[in-house]
């Protein structure tokens, strides 16, 4: 008993130690070691029968998908995949875990959010953080210089998620990327077109795509007096401007990141600007910015991009925003992020963003990081933030109290009398063999009312009713669940009649 009390005390102390280290923002390695110790102590403690039983739940930042949620998810995926295929993309898949080395040094300050796996026989492994780095590894490994691909899969981040806003530790990403040497801004414009097509098709509300360029950011930082070593960390501060005020961002840059106040003010003059192609033109005339080679290249490309976006008919959805500084280290050129807009409280106010639903950019150097000779494969891509979209679609359907079908069953094989199980089994098998989505109730003698009720609840449109008289006459009674009208259909015509009524092609091609 004393032993257990001692262990409980140590578990408590170790828990406090871990919390303290997290609050102090101690190194990831130290926190990881102390968490491992805590888990070992807890394991030795074992279950305590006197304590409350094990709480059955999914791990923090994860969730189960109910049939209803899965139906929503499949509809969303269907819209996205159709769009990706319409644009000529192939599909690939990669392992859910990568060698830790593959992911290291690719995400900047976000690296601390990577999930490391416990040692599995020598290889240090991590769960993938996104689909882009594995894609770059795939290109380098297979010596590919040209591909247009999409990849839909789960990724993992040790974030502290606000799940109510559609943020998780395990979540899907839907990525589309174009790899290869092409003329400037054509693939980039297509990525933005795809983003707009998908967000419009999903009908989740009005959206805006913010566009910037890493080279413009870097050039701007250089002329404002930010040292090279601080570029990335200042980037991550600037990127918060969509969530907090300039004052807060400035305080962070000056107070926490050691930037001189006058340098921060110079940055502020730039990053608080947003507009369209006219802002690009204006900055091309900026006496300081136009003298910076990187910024000039970026501005030139953005001018060209806006031309293509106009031809694609989406320029009204795009805003050049100098505060967009996506956190990932691998971006080298154009970067973009789509945000949903809330309706402004009063007319004349700026539209308010409610979080990113898609993002992407150009990353010309990432593949080269994996190539022994450093050979670069230019890439540009986008990622759809489907978890947030699922949340929005679910909320919208709940508000509309819309019934969602969770199965695709076209017909229920039913019987009106007892002792017809064998006939039901024969008929349902015929229907399955003909490619009809059919079900039957798993009871020998179900009541007709129960069978009809099941159809109502499951949204099954048709019932094929077998009766003794129908068997003698060689017909099946086909009943429409909603209109309740019944017709006798010859057994040999039943498949064709069901397909006709449910709008299914007459052959399984």
């Amino acid at each position: 008993m004393a032993e257990r009390a001692a262990l409980e005390e140590l578990v408590k102390l170790q828990g406090e130690r871990v919390r303290g280290l997290k609050q102090q923002k101690a190194s990831a390695e130290l926190i990881e070691e102390e968490v491992a110790k805590l888990l070992k102590l807890k394991a030795q403690l074992g279950p305590d029968e006197s304590k409350q039983k094990f709480v059955l739940k999914t791990p923090k930042g994860t969730r189960d998908y109910s049939p209803r949620q899965m139906a929503v998810r499949e509809k969303v995926f269907d819209v996205i995949i159709r769009c990706f295929k319409r644009h000529g993309a192939e599909v690939i898949d990669t392992p859910v875990f990568e060698l830790k080395e593959t992911l290291m040094g690719k995400y900047g300050e976000d690296s601390k959010l990577i999930y490391d796996l416990k040692d599995q026989g020598g290889e240090l492994l991590s769960l993938r953080y996104d689909l882009t780095v594995p894609f770059a590894r795939y290109l380098a490994m297979n010596k590919l210089t040209n591909i247009k691909r999409y990849h839909i899969a789960k990724v993992y981040r040790r974030d502290n998620p606000a799940m109510t806003r559609g943020r998780y530790r395990e979540f899907y990403q839907c990525d589309f990327d174009i790899a290869g040497n092409f003329d400037p801004m054509i693939p980039d414009a297509e990525c933005l077109k795809i983003m707009c097509e998908i967000l419009s098709s999903l009908q989740i509300g009005d959206f805006l795509v913010k566009v910037n360029d890493r080279r413009i950011l870097d050039g701007m930082f250089a002329i404002c007096g930010v040292s090279d070593s601080k570029f990335r960390t200042i980037c991550s501060s600037v990127d918060k401007l969509d969530k907090v005020s300039w004052e807060e961002v400035k305080n962070e840059m000056v107070g926490e990141k050691g930037l001189a106040p006058e340098v921060a003010d110079r940055i502020g003059d730039y990053v608080q600007q947003h507009g369209g192609v006219s802002l690009v033109e204006q900055l091309l005339q900026d006496p300081k910015l136009s003298q910076n080679k990187q910024a000039l290249e970026g501005l030139g490309d953005l001018k060209l991009l806006f031309e293509y976006l106009t031809l694609f008919g989406i320029d009204d959805k795009i805003s050049f925003d100098l505060s967009l500084a996506r956190g990932l280290d691998y971006y080298t050129g154009v970067i973009y992020e789509a945000v949903l807009l809330q309706t402004p409280a009063q007319a004349g106010e700026e539209p308010l963003g409610v979080g990113s639903v898609a993002a992407g950019g150009r990353y010309d150097g990432l593949v080269g990081m994996f190539d022994p000779k450093g050979r670069k494969v230019p890439c540009v891509g986008l990622s759809i933030g489907v978890e947030r979209i699922f949340s929005i679609v679910e909320q919208r359907l709940e508000a509309l109290e819309e019934k969602i079908r969770t199965t695709e069953t076209q017909v229920l094989v039913a019987s009106a009398q007892k002792k017809l199980l064998e006939e039901r089994l024969k008929l349902v098998s015929e229907l399955w063999d003909a490619g009809i989505k059919a079900e039957l109730l798993y009871k020998k003698n179900p009541k007709l009312l129960n069978q009809l009720q099941y159809c109502e609840e499951a949204g099954i449109p048709l019932v094929a009713i077998i009766g003794e008289q129908e068997l003698k006459d060689g017909v099946i009674k086909l009943r429409s669940v909603t209109s309740r009208e019944e017709v006798d259909v010859r057994r040999e015509d039943l498949v064709e009649e069901i397909k006709r009524r449910t709008g299914q092609p007459l052959c399984i091609c």
Epitope: L7, A36, L41, D119
Partner: antibody, heavy 120, light 107 residues
Framework: QVQLVESGGGLVKPGGSLRLSCAAS????????MTWIRQAPGKGLEWVSY????????NYADSVKGRFTISRDNAKNSLYLQMNSLRDEDTAVYFC?????????????WGQGTLVTVSS | DIQMTQSPSSVSASVGDRVTITCRAS??????LAWYQQKPGRAPKLLIF???SLQSGVPSRFSGSGSGTHFTLTISSLQPEDFATYYC?????????FGQGTKLEIK
């Protein structure tokens, strides 16, 4: 019963090297963090280094960092301390010890110690 | 590094006496403290861990208390085999440090 037996101590010249071993028995060696602690003649105790059961975590006192390397062989139930560039002030009895409750940095079982003398 | 200071550095007592040894930490260490007993030419022996938990097999006359920066080891009734040097050790953060020791001698 738990037993820890150190070996490998002896007389060595400054700048020389020595490898200490600690043979463990009577417990599941791979479950436990292990540590080396030393005691200079007539002095107090000094924590030198530790290693986790899975080899993943190690640490060293500043006074030995870069010169000493801790390692273990779980198959042989053995703990090691490779000591290079030895100095006079490394002269001490070196004890290996097991962490209490596998992971708590307190030695619940200690070896009898092995004497390392660094002298020209 | 966290400094551990023991007092007194030596104490003389008789069999049956109650003895208290104090250990102070240079910063708060919660209850991450252990007490050891060491006899000449022998390895230290763990008495108390987590400031007040008695290691199995250690007589109940030994007890520990305290948390934060101030800790005590108490021997309620000294026995002949208790004459030795006692060390405290913090297990809060690496490098884990020991007190300089308190020598308990026969009066």
């Amino acid at each position: 019963q738990v037993q820890l037996v150190e070996s490998g101590g002896g007389l060595v010249k400054p700048g020389g090297s020595l490898r200490l071993s600690c043979a463990a028995s009577g417990f599941t060696f791979s479950d436990y963090y292990m540590t080396w602690i030393r005691q200079a003649p007539g002095k107090g105790l000094e924590w030198v280094s530790y290693i986790s059961g899975s080899f993943r975590y190690t640490n060293y006192a500043d006074s030995v960092k870069g010169r000493f390397t801790i390692s273990r062989d779980n198959a042989k139930n053995s703990l090691y301390l490779q000591m290079n560039s030895l100095r006079d002030e490394d002269t001490a009895v070196y004890f290996c010890a097991r962490y209490v409750y596998q992971v708590v940095a307190i030695g619940d079982y200690w070896g009898q110690g092995t004497l390392v003398t660094v002298s020209s | 590094d966290i400094q551990m200071t023991q007092s007194p550095s030596s104490v003389s007592a008789s069999v049956g006496d109650r003895v208290t040894i104090t250990c102070r930490a240079s910063q708060g260490i919660s209850s991450w403290l252990a007490w050891y007993q060491q006899k000449p030419g022998r390895a230290p022996k763990l008495l108390i861990f987590a400031a007040s938990s008695l290691q199995s097999g250690v007589p109940s006359r030994f007890s520990g208390s305290g948390s934060g920066t101030h800790f005590t080891l108490t021997i309620s009734s000294l026995q002949p085999e208790d004459f030795a040097t006692y060390y405290c050790q913090q297990a809060k953060s690496f490098p884990y440090t020991f007190g300089q020791g308190t020598k308990l001698e026969i009066k």
